[in-house]
Amino acid sequence: MEADKDDTQQILKEHSPDEFIKDEQNKGLIDEITKKNIQLKKEIQKLETELQEATKEFQIKEDIPETKMKFLSVETPENDSQLSNISCSFQVSSKVPYEIQKGQALITFEKEEVAQNVVSMSKHHVQIKDVNLEVTAKPVPLNSGVRFQVYVEVSKMKINVTEIPDTLREDQMRDKLELSFSKSRNGGGEVDRVDYDRQSGSAVITFVEIGVADKILKKKEYPLYINQTCHRVTVSPYTEIHLKKYQIFSGTSKRTVLLTGMEGIQMDEEIVEDLINIHFQRAKNGGGEVDVVKCSLGQPHIAYFEE
């Protein structure tokens, strides 16, 4: 804040070199600016917090399991342009988490109509040991999930170059990069274009022929000499990633039902799960074939729903 005051005094001096503002006036003005400053800082902080919260809402962190790929056939490309990129696409669907609170259970039936019937009956009397417990069946209120396609294109004509030293002017560095990457002794070849960004110290180099990029990428580094000094720049594949068909979905589960009203039970969860399973297997109780039961009598559990 002291620095702020000094700055303000300096500004006042610069703006009125001939006028001498009274100390009191001056002090009042500084106080006003300082107050305004504090107010603005608070506002910035508030907005930053809001922004962070908003960002969190739209972030998705998913552990995508490893998928085994089945190689089916070799495609014969119709023309060279099909060889200039390797493309692949992944369908990603997020699992929707649901927290089963203490005294709740989730039951999944094999058939949708059974689940609907159990919900429509609402109240169910389940015999748990010597207790006849009234549970309530409800639809499961799910949070929204996402589904999208990740489309990845790996270029066979372009490479990414990073860690380029900031030792030359932009036009000269562009020349230097083109010259270095065109030298066949280092695995280079004829360069079509160089897109260099001095600020990030990176470039995208496009070659004329297919295969040059692959040769260069066999090594992770490439020598770039500038005034007798060897700088080792990092080379990596040039990939373009597109997000396609992004869909947000929400709704209720068709085969799973939420059971509530078991707060007072002091028993092993697995035993209660078995008893619920037995009760809802019976048609006379409005049930049918059960897939799975998950019960929470102590700590809340997370259940994941997928399409």
Partner: antibody
Framework: SLEESGGDLVKPGASLTLTCTAS?????????MCWVRQAPGKGLEWIAC????????TYYASWAKGRFTISKTSSTTVTLQMTSLTAADTATYFC?????????????????WGPGTLVTVSS | ALVMTQTPSSVSAAVGGTVTINCQAS??????LAWYQQKPGQPPKLLIY???NLESGVPSRFKGSGSGTEYTLTISDLECDDAATYYC??????????????FGGGTEVVVK
Amino acid sequence: SLEESGGDLVKPGASLTLTCTASGFSFSSSYYMCWVRQAPGKGLEWIACIYAGSSGSTYYASWAKGRFTISKTSSTTVTLQMTSLTAADTATYFCAREYSYDDYGDFWGFNLWGPGTLVTVSS
Amino acid sequence: ALVMTQTPSSVSAAVGGTVTINCQASQNIYTNLAWYQQKPGQPPKLLIYGASNLESGVPSRFKGSGSGTEYTLTISDLECDDAATYYCQSSLYSRIADRANAFGGGTEVVVK
């Protein structure tokens, strides 16, 4: 080889375009194509260079900026446009290829020259 | 700007003798120095590049040396055909200025 053309006798204030044509090779990333001049009985004076690679970056001697323009018109020709000519511009104008001798562009040399074309500025 | 200062402007020596030409750059040119020979009515001919590397076809009587800002061309076992004007030249990449190119003022070698 390289060959210059367009040299002429012109009046002060006039403009002139010189052309350099390469044969036996075409421009590539390993070269800068340049113009150098030599006034009668004087030394060599560098004017400008253009990178023969894809970027076509241009570089000029400080005295040449604004009045001289180097450009690549094809993969084998380079031109030098000169404006507001004065008697001091009277010289033999050489087209030269500046070649990168090492793999890294640290050692350069004008390893190919044209025979030169004479430009005379006189009223 | 890059400035190349060449000395002497003229030198004479007898056939079989040795001449030394000096070239000073206004800044470090990292041994990126070339030497040229020019005879009247002809374009220059490259003799040496990278301060000390002989261009193909150039006799080994021509020797280049130096580093930083100081460079030398030595011609030994002088022949009549060596009578010519010799120029040093450098080009320099830079972070703050255009890529510069400059020639020295030239040294006339007279063979007696």
